[in-house]
């Protein structure tokens, strides 16, 4: 029966005399007058079985003590840790010449675990053991035992087991503890590869190469290997494993991503929170599912947010010139969360009597710069038929439009070719400028070419350079533009519309809003 004692993880104990309860019962030769098993109390007042001998009076002592058979357990090299106390010969009067201060350690390999006798000739010497310190007497009165500790190793071993023997040659000595152990590199996980308990090699300098196996839910990146050193330490980790998609490293394991998280690839990255507008409903997700109405394009990475098709373009303006039409519009209010927005133009030729009877324009119509995939917000359409009604649709599209096409993504305008539009307006004036508004007035075009149905005012902040403009329509020849920013330069254009369509815009009028209201008359050129 043995009690449990704690030793380093890289040592496997084969024999520990301190853990044995009851008599050790090792074999002594001679049976009497040599080594004697004696129980002493340790610092915790627990009895320890020790072997003592103190035959310092007689010369030529040859007292042997042999352990029981010790199994090798596959170890090729074993270590013997001896804790002992040794009396200083000077403390023993009248023993000079016969008293010694060393003893000898021997071993004998055997497959037989029941050898009853000590045959000295079978044993090989490991070493002569001397004390680092010897004591006049060993003070355990205060229960602090002054012990020498010596460690020796022996190998390579090949038989099933072995015996140890201690030869006394005339010392006053007590063996307090004998521990036999071998060293192993303990089971460990490095770089997500598990390396098994590995017994060290036969030599004190040998390295044992060990291949690791990837932990659960991981895969090899490079073949994982390590070397088990003679001291039971793992050395030189090579290669590694990576957690599979849907798993991340936590404390040397690959754990499934939590709900609401995902990992798309086998990498050393952690699980990431699902991107905006997506979710995962199970552990170990490799991607996240898009929310209803949101989509992921084929070439979108799993890390990208789910997006949706854009809303319709804004502020579509048409300008008819005989059999050509110029269309211009603003970006949609909602791009769907994507940058890859483009525009497609749909041309429909409609009957004069029934505008609902429309059909595609066909290949004779030409578009500049192109009909589909427009990156700019304007297009020129030429080679139209004269005196014909056309409906043009501008569709805003992005990478996910194909998953959910809807009329809400387009804006349309209907025009008739080959009717003269009004001429441009010659003079636009700023009648009053305040901090937040500008009052505009203008003259009728020189050539109205019909009844002017309305005027269209286009304006934008000067430094926006027409990237973002607004449109105001009015039947009168004046209007108040409100909701402006103070001390900001604005550019205004006005044009007229008749049944034939819109005329050209006027020359720009530049006005800067004030901090103090004032009346300023524009002359069609810059005004401040």
């Amino acid at each position: 029966v043995t009690g449990s004692r704690v030793y380093p993880a890289n040592e496997v104990t084969l024999l520990d005399s301190r853990s044995v309860q009851g008599e050790l019962g090792w074999i002594a030769s001679p049976l009497e007058g040599g080594w004697e098993e004696v129980s002493i109390m340790d610092e915790k007042n627990t009895p320890i079985r020790t072997y003592q001998v103190c035959n310092v009076m007689e010369a030529s002592q040859n007292n042997w003590l042999r352990t029981d058979w010790i199994t090798r357990e596959g170890a090729q090299r074993v270590y013997i840790e001896i804790k002992f106390t040794l009396r200083d010969c000077n403390s023993l009067p009248g023993v000079m010449g016969t008293c010694k201060e060393t003893f000898n350690l021997y071993y004998y390999e055997s497959d037989n675990d029941k050898e009853r006798f000590i045959r000295e000739s079978q044993f090989g010497k490991i070493d002569t053991i001397a004390a680092d310190e010897s004591f006049t007497q060993v003070d355990i009165g205060d229960r602090i035992m002054k012990l020498n500790t010596e460690i020796r190793d022996v190998g390579p071993l090949s038989k099933k087991g072995f015996y140890l023997a201690f030869q006394d040659v005339g010392a006053c000595i007590a063996l307090v503890s004998v521990r036999v152990f071998y060293k192993k590199c303990p089971l460990t996980v490095r770089n997500l590869a598990q390396f098994p308990d590995t017994i060290t090699g036969a030599d004190t300098s040998s390295l044992v190469e060990v291949r690791g196996s990837c932990v659960n839910n991981s895969e090899e990146k490079d073949v994982p290997k390590m070397y088990c050193g003679a001291d039971g330490e793992w050395l030189v980790p090579i290669g590694n494993c990576l957690c599979n998609a849907g798993h991340e490293e936590q404390n040397g394991e690959c754990q499934a991503c939590k709900i609401g998280y995902y990992k798309a690839l086998s990498t050393d990255a952690s699980c990431a929170k699902c991107p905006p507008h997506s979710y995962s409903v199970w552990e170990g997700a490799t991607s996240c599912t898009c929310d209803r109405g949101f989509f992921r394009a084929d070439n979108d990475a799993a890390s990208m947010p789910c997006t949706r098709p854009p809303s319709a373009p804004l502020n579509l303006i048409s300008n008819v010139n005989e059999t050509s039409v110029n269309l211009e519009w603003s970006s949609p209010q909602n791009t769907g969360g994507r940058q890859d927005i483009s525009y497609n133009v749909v041309c429909k030729k409609c009957g004069a009597g029934d505008p609902s009877k429309c059909r595609p324009c066909g290949s004779g119509v030409h578009y500049t710069p192109q009909q589909n995939g427009l990156k700019t917000t304007r297009v020129s359409i030429t080679d139209l038929l004269a005196h014909t009604n056309y409906t043009f649709e501008i569709w805003a599209v992005n990478g996910v439009s194909k998953y959910n096409p809807s009329p809400d993504q387009s804006v349309s305008v209907t025009v008739t070719t080959n009717q003269a539009a009004p001429s441009s307006i010659a003079l636009v004036q700023a009648k009053e400028v305040t901090r937040y508004s500008v009052a505009l007035a203008w003259l009728e075009p020189d050539r109205p070419n019909g009844v002017i149905l309305e005027y269209e005012v286009k304006y934008y902040e000067k430094d926006q350079n027409e990237r973002s403009y607004r449109i105001v329509r009015t039947a009168a020849r004046n209007t108040d533009i409100k909701g402006l920013n103070p001390l900001t330069s604005y550019v205004f254009h006005v044009r007229a519309r008749t049944a034939a369509g819109y005329g050209d815009f006027s020359e720009p009028l530049e006005v800067t809003t004030n901090t103090v209201p004032s009346r300023i008359i524009g002359d069609g050129a810059n005004s401040t």
């Epitope: 009076m57 004591f135 006049t136 060993v138 355990i140 006053c172």
Partner: antibody
């Protein structure tokens, strides 16, 4: 069993000598040292010294050099204490005692029954 | 030379009581001293030696402790046969005894 047998009482005149034997039995005589202890009447114990029974090498305590001699006859497993030039103050019981040496401490584990030496004119 | 002083010189106890005997060294000694028991007209008998080990045949009511300069022999429950004189002893290059403590019946 282990025994130490001493001779009976001795009465000696001052200036005379006495040789007190101590015969060992029940163990290997040469394996253990032999101590000699004096106890004067009504007094405590006094260690006189010991002899290495293997080498014959004696060790004398302070105050017991000169007139006191330890000797052996290993052939009959006997140790001897010889006192010469006896004085009245040498009157005492003389004990032989086998020495027990251990790493953790020494002691005298087997004692003879003692020999009373009386010095009187 | 190390001098051992035992106290008290006489200790009166009743059978069944605990007896504590003291042994003080004039300088620090490196291990527990052995203790001896001597009854009138008899040779001393070894009670306890190194590492507080009881000698063969000594009952476990006898125990020893201490370190440095102060040592104690304890008889946990004194029996009638325990009334005697007790000596401690120091060993080193020269051995010396204390003057003894007499344990008598109260």
């Amino acid at each position: 069993q282990v025994q130490l047998l001493q001779s009976g009482a001795e009465v000696k005149k001052p200036g005379a000598s006495v040789k007190v034997p101590c015969k060992a039995s029940g163990y290997t005589f040469t394996s253990r040292a032999m101590s000699w202890v004096r106890q004067a009447p009504g007094q405590g114990l006094e260690w006189m010294g010991w002899i290495n029974t293997n080498t014959g090498n004696p060790t004398y305590a302070q105050g017991f050099t000169g007139r006191f001699v330890f000797s052996l006859d290993t052939s009959v497993s006997t140790a001897y204490l010889q006192i010469s030039s006896l004085k009245a103050e040498d009157t005492a019981v003389y004990y032989c005692a086998r020495v027990r040496l251990t790493v953790y401490g020494d002691g005298m584990d087997v004692w003879g029954q003692g020999t009373l030496v009386t010095v009187s004119s | 030379e190390i001098v051992l002083t035992q106290s008290p010189a006489t200790l009166s106890v009743s059978p069944g009581e605990r007896a504590t005997l003291s042994c003080r060294a004039s300088q620090s000694v490196s291990s527990n001293p052995p203790w001896y028991q001597q009854k009138p007209g008899q040779a001393p008998r070894l009670l306890i030696y190194g590492a507080s080990t009881r000698a063969t045949g000594i009952p476990d009511r006898f125990s020893a402790s201490g370190s440095g300069t102060d040592f104690t022999l304890t008889i946990s429950r004194v029996e009638p046969e325990d009334f005697a004189v007790y000596y401690c002893q120091q060993y080193g290059s020269s051995w010396t005894f204390g003057q003894g403590t007499k344990v008598e019946i109260k």
